[in-house]
Amino acid sequence: TQHGIRLPLRSGLGGAPLGLRLPRETDEEPEEPGRRGSFVEMVDNLRGKSGQGYYVEMTVGSPPQTLNILVDTGSSNFAVGAAPHPFLHRYYQRQLSSTYRDLRKGVYVPYTQGKWEGELGTDLVSIPHGPNVTVRANIAAITESDKFFINGSNWEGILGLAYAEIARPDDSLEPFFDSLVKQTHVPNLFSLQLCGAGFPLNQSEVLASVGGSMIIGGIDHSLYTGSLWYTPIRREWYYEVIIVRVEINGQDLKMDCKEYNYDKSIVDSGTTNLRLPKKVFEAAVKSIKAASSTEKFPDGFWLGEQLVCWQAGTTPWNIFPVISLYLMGEVTNQSFRITILPQQYLRPVEDVATSQDDCYKFAISQSSTGTVMGAVIMEGFYVVFDRARKRIGFAVSACHVHDEFRTAAVEGPFVTLDMEDCGYNIPQTDESTLMT
């Protein structure tokens, strides 16, 4: 999971205002137990800061110690700062918790850059703006780290919401969500609405603004418009899905669909960008460049390393194409597509020199570990992680940033043959994309 490239936060732009929650009629299948349509206590429970992820408030221990925890669907450990660190305002103090139990086992998690290590234990955990339950969960108490915590990010730990297969040190360490479902009546499902601001926010705006919602145990119908479309979870490790086609402004990239999923495609709230395999990235950039050729952008921009700016309020959104990813559907030979706007893949960046310009980074980047559908994708949609039925749902988010001409979309069905062939069969190795 990659932190440090995106503040996805919303402050009232685009879509219905978050404060307005109207019940809607829906033509969806009948709801299962626990999937009621309103979760008022959980709506707006996420906050975030640019490039630094979305976090939820959690409490650990007895008496409860409050911490902000990064919501990460690309990893599977619940890990919290448990020792003083220059970037932490607060940390988990195990010695103050009467319910802490030491597992007498260490854990070491190296990343492409940086690492964290700590001591495993269990304690009582709850989510104040979540279900009204307390669970005993595994906690990695981080005692040492390098380039993990982010200065000013306002989070002190990470909640890995993926499956046990990628938990560290091994798959015997039960992830938090598994513990939650086992110990309570919370249905085996959660949903995320990540709300991008569409403009950079300073520290005080971040703390005062809403970043989105994590609905634990259900689906809140006020958070999306239209229908939810589901794609199968290919394998329960990361939230792995299969992309069957990619279009730029309706033009098919015409690549062998295996390339789109080489070596996997995952949905990861802890990554900022839409990350694409090298060949796919190069083809996509070539197509986006061609579509936006009325303006010439610096080479560094397409690498995500250089800003482009326009006079405030004059960003020419219309010259940039929409990007559609077709995902395998639940029915044989059926797919659906999710479409994002430049408002999602051009990331607003604070320009320290002047407020007269709106500046952006290109938030699509190259990957050597497959496609990562990070915040760039997720900010367009309400995403349902339906673990019980081994599927992920997408609907247009009520808070996505758009303009008067175009909106993000989830559309289907489309006939697509031989979709199973699009999946790549990865050689078995112990790998994790944590922070890559």
Epitope: P298, L303, E305, Q306
Partner: antibody, heavy 117, light 107 residues
Framework: EVKLMESGPGLVAPSQSLSISCTVS????????VDWVRQPPGKGLEWLGV???????NYNSALMSRLSISKDNSKSQVFLKMNSLQTDDTAMYYC???????????WGTGTTVTVSS | DIVMTQTTSPLSVSLGDRVTISCRAS??????LNWYQQRPDGTVKLLIY???RLHSGVPSRFSGSGSGTDYSLTISNLEQEDIATYFC?????????FGGGTKLELK
């Protein structure tokens, strides 16, 4: 405070290779690119190449065949390697931190490389 | 490659002068033009980035302007410490390139 410090061999024999390191502090190599620039005695600045925050590299087209730039993010070091040195590669070699507008906003003090037998 | 051509060097100046150094690119560089100062001791500093933005800590007597292929650096009231060599640099297209430099010399 952002700092960059080059360190090189000083003297290199013709046809041999050059290795220079640039140790940085005050910023993360995963967030910002680092460029290499050289200046032969009494001449102007010549751009050699860049290693981007994301890890990709680009080079001066005239030198691409014998130039290689790499980095170690965890050690905050950037490396320049150049093969088959000739006397006209004698120069002051600088590393510089890149900003998000394509400017090189902090430079190292440079390291002198003399190619001579 | 984009070729950057600077004002002929050296340039004879007097303290207190308003000095303008020009730089021409062989193709449109969309304002991704930077100016650097190199002191006689070899120290290089960024002065102006993105055509006209003053780098932090740089005195306000330095300014930049231009668009397309033509750019300039102006020092409004030349001081002794400004006697140095100035380079333009395009940050638009890889491979990035520098101008040949303009050395200021006191008359």
């Amino acid at each position: 405070e952002v700092k960059l410090m080059e360190s090189g061999p000083g003297l290199v024999a013709p046809s041999q290779s050059l290795s220079i390191s640039c140790t940085v502090s005050g910023f993360s190599l995963t967030s910002y690119g680092v460029d290499w620039v050289r200046q032969p005695p009494g001449k102007g600045l010549e751009w050699l190449g860049v290693v981007w925050g994301g890890g990709s590299t680009n080079y001066n087209s005239a030198l691409m065949s014998r130039l290689s730039i790499s980095k170690d993010n965890s050690k905050s070091q950037v490396f320049l390697k150049m093969n088959s040195l000739q006397t006209d590669d004698t120069a002051m070699y600088y590393c510089a931190k890149r900003d998000y507008f394509g400017g090189l906003n902090v430079w190292g003090t440079g390291t002198t490389v003399t190619v001579s037998s | 490659d984009i070729v950057m051509t600077q004002t002929t060097s050296p340039l004879s100046v007097s303290l207190g002068d308003r000095v303008t150094i020009s730089c021409r690119a062989s193709q449109d560089i969309s304002k991704y033009l930077n100016w650097y100062q190199q002191r006689p001791d070899g120290t290089v500093k960024l002065l102006i980035y993105y055509t006209s933005r003053l780098h932090s800590g740089v005195p306000s007597r330095f300014s930049g302007s231009g668009s397309g292929t033509d750019y300039s650096l102006t020092i409004s009231n030349l001081e002794q410490e400004d006697i140095a060599t100035y380079f333009c640099h395009q940050g638009h297209k890889i491979p990035y390139t520098f101008g040949g430099g303009t050395k200021l010399e006191l008359k």
